[in-house]
Every structure is written in structure tokens, then in C-alpha cells.
Interface confidence: low
């Protein structure tokens, strides 16, 4: 999947299986990514587990789990808030669009999470105070979690190079440039560009991600995934000057 | 936890959060709130030895005291109940705490935290 980190780096990761996105004293988020096509290096998110850890007299531990074709509007225990404690309403799940869009507010840690199902796959977005991100037991022993440190270099796909290689080549793009088996030949580059332009008029990294996804999979739902990802940034990002990321902000992963 | 630093943090936060914005940096009220905060941390010091939140609060108070030329002696403030800021960015507003400290219990030195964003989508 495409990842925008807490430090506004933009990466395309081919990580497969379960990986931690966020891990601190208050919150643990783990995603499971699966290949979009058999043998493909490109992966998308098929499962998401969010654990809100037991916190003082505010909330009980709550676990939220979403999978492909199952986007519940409740925690795994069936509740929609933080439990029986007096601050239980400082953690709430709201269903925005049934089966497609859920928002979780954890006011006790100033955090908003948006989970969507777009097509077959899930998208995730979070707005969280830096204090919460930095509230970890022991910095030295922290593992690799993606929102903070980005993907390992060997797990990244250079989709911008892919974008450059495919530009103007139509359906006859070089197979070597593709990180996945060739998507249906009926989906030429020009069509991908047109579909992405329709939803994402600014040629930023979200637009480029959209083009990459359409060429990789031939699945038009990925246009919506990029569109909603940008919409979530508009809602959740505190710096309105950083909504659109461009090629120059591309960076190597963290430690 | 026997360490009550989070209570001190939230009391300071509510004392410096009015109906519109944090108390103006240069007002006597801000210094009074800082002195209350310092007093609160001293009261809980014995049970907070080694607590990261406690030590960062103590250092933060010292920094703020010197930044704002607050004298160590002087009046202290009572924490006041926080009311939500006026209409503006709806996201800012709805993430802000309400009266219950559970609505935002982690603040240390600033009424408005620095927010950060992470997103994952597509393939």
C-alpha cells in the first residue's frame, strides 16, 4: 500500500503479512497486507486491528477489527464506546457510511481514526497529537512501525520511477517497469491518467499513486482509494500547506 | 498509578484554557497557573521518581517560568473548567477536551497539541 508517515514522507510499500503501523502507550494499530494479484509485489490492506489500551478511569481496553467485506461499526466486544468507566464516551465509534466508512474518536488522547473499505481493500488515516506518538515505554527497544519510521528500504517500490517509465507508453509499457504482473491490456496509461485526473486534478503524489494502482491492478476502485485518502488528509492534517505532497518531498525511510 | 502527574497536567491545562485560547503568555494568570502546576508536581514528587511524564513536566515548568519571567513566589490559580473554543476548524474543535479529564488527559505544557497524521491506502 501507499504510506504517508507522521513526518509526511510518502512511500509505496510491498510489505506482506502483519505489520505494526502505530505502537505506543495508548494505541496499537496492526495491518495485514496481501498481494493485489497472484505473484504481485504490490500489496493492499486486507485486515486492520486497532487496540485502544486500558487507560486509567477513562476507557477499558477496546479492540477494533476490520477485514475485507467486514467493516463493523463496533468494537469486537460489540460495544461502541470505551466501556463501563465514567469517561467511556471519550472513545466512540461512528458509522459514516454503512460498510464503507467508520470514524473512531478517542478524545482522551485527542485522536481521530478513519477506516474505509474501498473496493475490496481497506484504507486507514489517523490524526494524533505528537505527545501520544512519542509516549512509548522505551525508545531504544521500539520495533519498526510504519507510521513513525516508514517502510524498510528493501520493502519499498519506487512508484515514481515506474510512473516516469510508463508515461506515454500506453499499453505497451515495459514489463520490467512493472512491480506486478501486467494488468489487463485494455487499461492503457492514457485511460488511467484520465480516470485519476477526474478525481484528483492536482498532479501530486496521490494522483501518481492512483495512476500506479490502476496500471498495476486494472481496478478502478483504487482511484477512489486515492481520492478518499486525500479527502481524509484534508480533514485530519493540521498543516493545510502540506495537504498535497510532491515528488521533491520523497525521502528515505527512517532508521 | 500512585504518581499523580497526569492530574497536575490536566489541571494546568484547564487553568490555561479559556473560552477562546490559552491564557495570554504575558498575563499574571499564566504565571499563577504555572506556580500552581509547580506546587502540584512538588506534592506528587515522592511517588513520581523516575516517571518520564513527571520529569518532563518539571523541566517544562522551569522553562516556561523563565520564558515568561514568572517569579517563583506569588499567587496561584484555581483550575477552571474548560469550554470549547468558538466555531472555526471543526476538526480542531471536536478534538478539544471537554470537562471530563478523560477528554484530554495527556497534555503537559501546551493547551493545543501539535497534531500529526498518518495514512495508508491503495496498493
Amino acid at each position: 500500500p501507499h504510506l504517508r508517515t507522521f513526518t509526511d514522507r510518502f512511500q509505496t510499500c510491498k510489505v506482506q503479512g502483519a505489520w505494526p503501523l502505530i505502537d505506543n502507550n495508548y494505541l496499537n494499530v496492526q495491518v495485514t497486507n496481501t498481494p493485489v494479484l497472484p505473484g504481485s509485489a504490490a500489496t493492499a490492506t486486507s485486515k486492520l486491528t486497532i487496540i485502544f489500551k486500558n487507560f486509567q478511569e477513562c476507557v477499558d481496553q477496546k479492540v477494533y477489527q476490520a477485514e475485507m467485506d467486514e467493516l463493523p461499526a463496533a468494537f469486537v466486544d460489540g460495544s461502541k464506546n470505551g466501556g463501563d468507566k465514567h469517561g467511556a464516551n471519550s472513545l466512540k465509534i461512528t458509522e459514516k457510511v454503512s460498510g464503507q466508512h467508520v470514524e473512531i474518536r478517542a478524545k482522551y488522547i485527542g485522536t481521530t481514526i478513519v477506516v474505509r473499505q474501498v473496493g475490496r481493500y481497506l484504507t486507514f488515516a489517523v490524526r494524533v497529537p505528537e505527545e501520544v506518538v512519542n509516549a512509548v515505554e522505551d525508545w531504544d527497544s521500539q520495533g519498526l512501525y510504519l507510521c513513525l519510521r516508514g517502510c524498510p528500504l528493501n520493502q519499498q517500490i519506487d512508484f515514481q520511477a515506474f510512473h516516469t517509465n510508463t508515461e506515454g507508453t500506453g499499453a505497451r509499457r515495459l514489463a520490467a517497469a512493472s512491480p506486478a504482473p501486467t494488468a489487463p491490456e485494455t487499461f492503457p496509461y492514457e485511460t488511467a491518467v484520465a480516470k485519476c485526473k477526474e478525481k484528483l486534478p492536482v498532479e501530486d503524489l496521490y494522483y501518481q499513486a492512483c495512476v500506479f494502482d490502476l496500471l498495476t491492478t486494472g481496478d478502478v476502485n483504487f482511484t477512489l482509494a486515492a481520492y478518499y485518502a486525500l479527502e481524509d488528509v484534508k480533514m485530519l492534517h493540521s498543516n493545510k500547506d502540506k495537504l498535497h505532497l510532491y515528488e521533491r518531498t520523497r525521502d528515505l525511510p527512517g532508521r | 498509578s500512585p504518581c499523580k502527574i497526569l492530574k497536575c497536567n490536566s489541571e494546568f491545562w484547564s487553568a490555561t484554557s479559556g473560552s477562546h485560547a490559552p491564557a495570554s503568555d504575558d498575563t499574571p494568570e499564566f504565571c499563577a497557573a504555572l506556580r500552581s502546576y509547580a506546587l502540584c508536581t512538588r506534592r506528587t514528587a515522592r511517588t513520581c521518581r523516575g516517571d518520564l511524564a513527571y520529569h518532563s513536566a518539571v523541566h517544562g515548568i522551569e522553562d516556561l517560568m523563565s520564558q515568561h519571567n514568572c517569579s517563583k513566589d506569588g499567587p496561584t490559580s484555581q483550575p477552571r473548567l474548560h469550554t470549547l473554543p468558538p466555531a472555526g476548524d471543526s476538526q480542531e474543535r471536536s478534538d478539544s477536551p471537554e470537562i471530563c479529564h478523560c477528554e484530554k488527559s495527556f497534555h503537559k505544557h501546551s493547551a493545543t497539541p501539535n497534531y500529526t497524521h498518518c495514512g495508508l491506502f491503495g496498493d
Epitope: 479492540v63 515505554e137 522505551d138 | 498509578s1 518520564l52
Partner: antibody, heavy 120, light 109 residues
Framework: EVQLVQSGAEVKKPGASVKVSCKAS????????ISWVRQAPGQGLDWMGW????????NYAQKLQGRVTMTTDTSTSTAYMELSSLRSEDTAVYYC?????????????WGQGTLVTVSS | QSALTQPRSVSGSPGQSVTISCTGT?????????VSWYQQHPGKAPKLMLY???KRPSGVPDRFSGSKSGNTASLTISGLQAEDEADYYC?????????FGGGTKVTVL
């Protein structure tokens, strides 16, 4: 040297409570969580719960909810586990263990264990 | 009973390799990157041997290795030695599950 030293063996009657202590040394106590694990005679290991000395956050095994309380005293770098309404099946060796990373991920240093016998 | 299944016992001669399996569900093992293994000698406290599926803490001999395939995690001891005779437990954290396997007795013949 990182060490966890536990309190001595206890004999309790059914219905009573027991409080086991675990004193940490050789590292910053608030930088690591503490898990508690028990082992009945001849049986396997059983995870009881976890506490963060940093924040006071706890998470208890579902089956012990309501009977177990974990606390810490950061001034003495000591963790405590109290189990109430004891029954004979609570007879076990109780271990505290330092958590290496995150709340539950692995336990890298263990106490020597405290035998708690529940008998009428 | 435990939701992580281990064989009751495995045995091998000195110098041989033995593998202990730990089978769970997709949430407890398959999707978890947090599987650890513990060695326990009789009357002693457990000792961490592997964490995060494959990582070895300092001081643990490199004859101990870990892997995972599907919903099964494995601990392999290659070049078995007399002091490896002990009970071994797998442990996994994923989502709602935090649990130990039932334990495997390793006997050095």
C-alpha cells in the same frame, strides 16, 4: 545487572487475598512494562496481565478480571500483584517478568518466582 | 486448554536437530509478528530464547532459530546439547489474544 527479585512463599486459606511483590533493579523502572505469569504445579505457563509503571495502564487476562490487581510504586521500583478470593486452583508459582518492547510482546527478564499455596 | 498447540514432547540425540511447532489461529500466530519462545529448566524461571518470531537475545546460542509458516511458528535447535533438555513454551500476542502454548518437553537421548 538487570534483576527482578520477588517476595517469599505464601500459604493462604481459600477466600483470602495474596499480594506478591517484585523489586526491579539495574534499569529504568518506568521504561519497561511488567507482566505477571503463573504456573500451577506440573502445568504450563499462564499469562495473568500487564502493567505499565510509566502510566499505570493495566491489562488483565479475561478470566482473572475482577480478582487481580496490578500496581507499581515507582519510588521503590517495585511492582505488585494482588489476587483476591483465592481458591485451591490458584496454587501456583507466580512470576513477574520485564516486558522487552510494547505492552505484551516478549518478556526478557524474569523474577525467581513466588510459590503461593492455597489450602484450608 | 491453550489456543496455541505444541507437541507434548520431542527428543533427539546430541548433535541432532529438533523442531518444536506452535500452531494457532490466523490472529494468534498467522498475522502476528510477535511470537516469542521460552526455555524452562525444572524448578527454574523461564528464559527468553527468541522474540519477534526469529530474533535471538544476546547470550542465546545461535543453534536456536525461529521461523513461521502460515499459522504455525517453529523453534529449531540444531546441534542438540545436553543442557538443551528442558520445557519450551511459545507465546504470542496479536490483537485480543495473549497466550502461551501448552509447552513441549525436549529430551536429549
Amino acid at each position: 545487572e538487570v534483576q527482578l527479585v520477588q517476595s517469599g512463599a505464601e500459604v493462604k486459606k481459600p477466600g483470602a487475598s495474596v499480594k506478591v511483590s517484585c523489586k526491579a533493579s539495574g534499569y529504568t523502572f518506568t521504561s519497561h512494562g511488567i507482566s505477571w505469569v503463573r504456573q500451577a504445579p506440573g502445568q504450563g505457563l499462564d499469562w495473568m496481565g500487564w502493567i505499565s509503571p510509566y502510566s499505570g495502564n493495566t491489562n488483565y487476562a479475561q478470566k482473572l478480571q475482577g480478582r487481580v490487581t496490578m500496581t507499581t510504586d515507582t519510588s521503590t521500583s517495585t511492582a505488585y500483584m494482588e489476587l483476591s478470593s483465592l481458591r485451591s486452583e490458584d496454587t501456583a508459582v507466580y512470576y513477574c517478568a520485564r516486558v522487552g518492547s510494547g505492552p505484551y510482546y516478549y518478556m526478557d527478564v524474569w523474577g525467581q518466582g513466588t510459590l503461593v499455596t492455597v489450602s484450608s | 486448554q491453550s489456543a496455541l498447540t505444541q507437541p507434548r514432547s520431542v527428543s533427539g540425540s546430541p548433535g541432532q536437530s529438533v523442531t518444536i511447532s506452535c500452531t494457532g489461529t490466523s490472529s494468534s500466530v498467522g498475522d502476528s509478528i510477535y511470537v516469542s519462545w521460552y526455555q524452562q529448566h525444572p524448578g527454574k524461571a523461564p528464559k527468553l530464547m527468541l522474540y519477534d518470531v526469529t530474533k535471538r537475545p544476546s547470550g542465546v546460542p545461535d543453534r536456536f532459530s525461529g521461523s513461521k509458516s502460515g499459522n504455525t511458528a517453529s523453534l529449531t535447535i540444531s546441534g542438540l546439547q545436553a543442557e538443551d533438555e528442558a520445557d519450551y513454551y511459545c507465546y504470542s500476542y496479536a490483537g485480543t489474544d495473549t497466550l502461551f502454548g501448552g509447552g513441549t518437553k525436549v529430551t536429549v537421548l
